[in-house]
Interface confidence: low
């Protein structure tokens, strides 16, 4: 299927202009290749009318142009002074006309309606409100005011000042007569329906002295906005329906093959299971506008989406809607990354998160998708180092490997960690991605002691056992803090042939703290990695206590039971998208978690990867 995308159908009226926008994947080849607009003839050939190389056919001379926007991956064809002869089938495309990189566009130019002289034209979107103005002369001020709809040769009474209301307009129409001295009455019709379209007649008085005014009401279905997003990326639908529906339930639905509209998500708590873990409906602003974010875009997400407002939380005739046509480009710039990552209870996961490589300085975030009601995504960690309190010691966001990917490590896994997580930045919102963490049966590969109590001034050794399959990996210990995990200096890792042969004696990496100080208290991670790609980790908490004459006691790390203040990816989406520079804080509430102490440094801490015998015969 061609990745070029545009409007399937374009309609206009004689004498008017149209602007046709076509989208293409903005690869360097596509950005610089020829763009064209051609008309399909009976023979099947497509005759160029205008191209990006400056060609304009004689038929289009002086009334058409093609503008390329390579940075956006779009080009626009403007055609003015339309005539009925312009109706037909066209293609917008890249390269040569006969190649497949094109999109079919149907253009219909119709004759403008013949309206009686002095007709006022009202053009309003479906579901909106229109106010029809009806002037009258002083002598008709005390007489009956009415609005009729012309149907064929007859006129049907819609409303009058004697309190008649046509049943088709019940509960959505009112006639207003102003105070004395104002010679105009108005008819307000709310929640316009497509069937309201037509010619109306205002009348004041009767007989030969009556005042009449024609009004042509054009009720338009919303023109779908074309949205072109990359596979695996993210799309945001901003829905602004107006203050009049600010307190009405909102929804996003997708038009199906039967041309009905299936609810994707609504504010009443309904959500399509196909979007589980990858959709948020962000709370509405005071003006009633709201947005829906969908991540992890799939080809099957393509289609026409409508947002709207109705007390039932689904599409109903006569209520305002907005429309989008979503195209998902398979030639995606967003790299493939695992959508499901599996870990075992007690073990760890390392999640790779893509971001736009042009935005290496952007702030990185990781949040936990929560499905309750409209969905929300409380931030768990960010690249500035803030971590939610209940994740202290087991969550870290690393800038590595860089160049379009960052890493999030979560260890000490429990079944409660299963769920959907989002990777995002304060930069390009289209690069938001979703990953599902699943907790499966099994044992962690790395084994560390469950709890360690160190004595001030003495030496501490912490062993970390790893299996043969990690023998070729780089092993490390690091001290966890809010701002990351500071790798501790490593000693020589022993004879290399032991690792090649996976000698039984080579399956231990130990951390030595000598002498232990107060600053050494905190979380330590043992981990494996290959270059800048991180593998499994295991965490151990070191408590530091005074030297005792007899016995010792493990001091458990303090854990706050109270839920911390949360930063939540909901209303903050707008700030992310506005790319706030001065203060890229996304959310109103902030919790700065204090550092758990200085980084262990210098020669006091060392990592030794050697035989278990040398470490005092710890179990393997």
């Amino acid at each position: 299927k061609s990745p070029v995308f545009g409007p399937q159908e374009v309609s206009s009226v004689e004498g008017n202009s149209v602007s046709i926008k076509c989208y293409y994947p903005p690869t360097s080849v596509n950005r610089h290749t020829r763009k064209y607009w051609c008309r399909k003839g009976a023979s099947g050939r497509c005759i160029t009318l205008v191209s990006s190389e400056g060609y304009v056919s004689s038929n289009y001379a002086g009334r058409a142009n093609l503008t390329n926007f390579p940075e956006n991956g779009t080009f626009v064809v403007n055609i003015a002074q339309l005539s009925r002869d312009d109706s037909g089938h066209y293609k917008c495309g890249l390269g040569i006309n006969s190649r497949g990189l094109s999109f079919d566009v149907s253009l219909e130019v119709s004759q403008g309606p013949e309206l009686p002289n002095g007709t006022e034209v009202y053009t309003v979107d479906v579901g909106r409100t229109v106010t029809i103005k009806c002037p009258f002369k002083t002598e008709n001020a005390p007489k009956t005011k009415a609005l009729y709809k012309k149907i064929g040769q007859t006129s049907v009474l819609v409303i009058d000042s004697r309190n008649y209301v046509n049943p088709n307009y019940k509960d959505r129409i009112r006639l207003r007569i102003p105070g004395t001295g104002q010679l105009i009455f108005t008819v307000v019709i709310d929640r316009l329906r497509l069937s309201d379209h037509g010619l109306y007649l205002c009348q004041a008085g009767d007989g030969s002295n009556r005042d009449e005014k024609n009004a042509d009401l054009q009720v338009l279905e919303p023109e779908p906005e074309l949205v072109y997003e990359d596979l695996r990326g993210s799309v945001t639908f901003h829905c602004a329906l107006g203050l009049e529906v600010a307190n009405v339930a909102k929804f996003l639905c997708r038009v199906n093959s039967r041309e009905t509209c299936d609810v994707v998500i609504n504010t009443l708590g309904k959500r399509d299971s196909a979007f589980e873990g990858r959709i948020l409906l962000n709370p509405q602003d005071k003006d009633g506008s709201f947005s829906v974010v969908i991540t992890g875009l799939r080809k099957e997400d393509e289609g026409r989406y409508l947002c709207g407002a109705h007390s039932d939380g689904q599409l109903q005739e006569g209520w305002p809607i907005q429309a989008w046509q979503l195209f998902v480009n398979e030639e995606s710039t967003i790299p493939r990354s695992p959508t499901v990552v599996k870990g075992v209870a007690g073990g760890s996961v390392a999640v790779l998160c893509p971001y736009n490589p042009k935005e290496s300085q952007s702030l990185k975030y990781w949040c936990l998708w929560e499905g309750a009601q409209n969905g929300r995504c409380p931030l768990l960690v960010e690249s500035q180092g803030l971590v939610q309190e209940q994740y202290e010691g087991r969550l870290s966001l690393l800038q590595e490997p860089g160049n379009g990917t960052f890493t999030v490590i979560l260890n000490q896994l429990t079944t409660q960690d299963a769920g959907f997580y989002w990777c995002l930045t304060n930069g390009d919102t289209r690069w938001r991605t979703t990953v599902e963490i699943k907790i499966i049966e099994g044992e962690p590969n790395l084994k560390v002691p469950g709890n360690v109590t160190a004595v001030l001034g003495e030496t501490l050794n912490i062993p970390c056992h790893f299996p043969c399959k990690f023998s070729s990996y780089e092993k490390y210990w690091c001290k966890w803090s809010n701002t990351g995990c500071q790798t501790l200096p490593s000693q020589d890792e022993g004879p290399s042939e032991a690792f090649v042969n996976c000698d039984e004696n080579s399956r231990l990496v130990s951390l030595t703290l000598n002498p232990v100080t107060r600053a050494d208290e905190g979380w330590y991670w043992c981990g494996v990695k290959q270059g800048h790609f991180y593998g499994e980790t295991a965490a151990v908490y070191v408590a530091v206590e005074e030297k005792k004459v007899a016995g010792s006691r493990y001091v458990s790390p303090a854990k706050a039971d109270a839920a911390p203040d949360e930063k939540v990816l909901d209303s903050g989406v707008r700030e992310i998208e506005n790319k706030a520079i001065q203060d890229p804080r996304l959310f109103a509430e902030e919790k700065v978690v204090a550092d758990t102490g200085d980084q262990a440094g210098g020669s006091r801490a060392s990592v030794d990867s050697s035989s278990s015998e040398e470490q005092g015969g710890s179990s393997k």
């Epitope: 159908e9 149907s106 497509l194 005739e317």
Partner: nanobody, 123 residues
């Protein structure tokens, strides 16, 4: 206002063909999609096929499966339904409707209807 008049119905043997036509008159609008629906005795009116104003988008009900073809001629303001390999279960009154709404498969979004034309398929 749009007036719609269907024609072309009648009695036909199973396996035969019919071509229904719908003529639109009055104050027509270029943005109307046209649809065919049918209603068998004692059943609800069901969607058969629809065609966008430009003819660029065509929709068929699942049961059609290549049996029917919808087309339109905007110059003549007509929409036709070519019905082949007719079966007794295709017996119904066939209605032509017009809508400016994108949800062409749903009868409640149609603004105007014709009076219907009877199609009877005998076995």
């Amino acid at each position: 206002e749009v007036q719609l008049v269907e024609s072309g119905g009648g009695l036909v043997q199973a396996g035969g063909s019919l071509r229904l036509s719908c003529a639109a008159s009055g104050r027509t609008f270029s943005r109307y999609a046209m649809g065919w629906f049918r209603q068998a005795p004692g059943k609800e009116r069901e969607f058969v096929a629809a065609i966008a104003w430009s003819g660029g988008a065509i929709y068929y009900a699942d049961f059609v499966k290549g049996q029917f073809t919808i087309s339109r001629d905007n110059a003549k303001n007509t929409v036709d339904l070519e019905m082949n390999r007719l079966k007794p279960e295709d017996t119904a009154v066939y209605y032509c409707g017009s809508t400016r709404d994108p949800r062409v498969g749903d009868k409640k979004f149609y603004d105007y209807w014709g009076q219907g034309t009877q199609v009877t398929v005998s076995s």
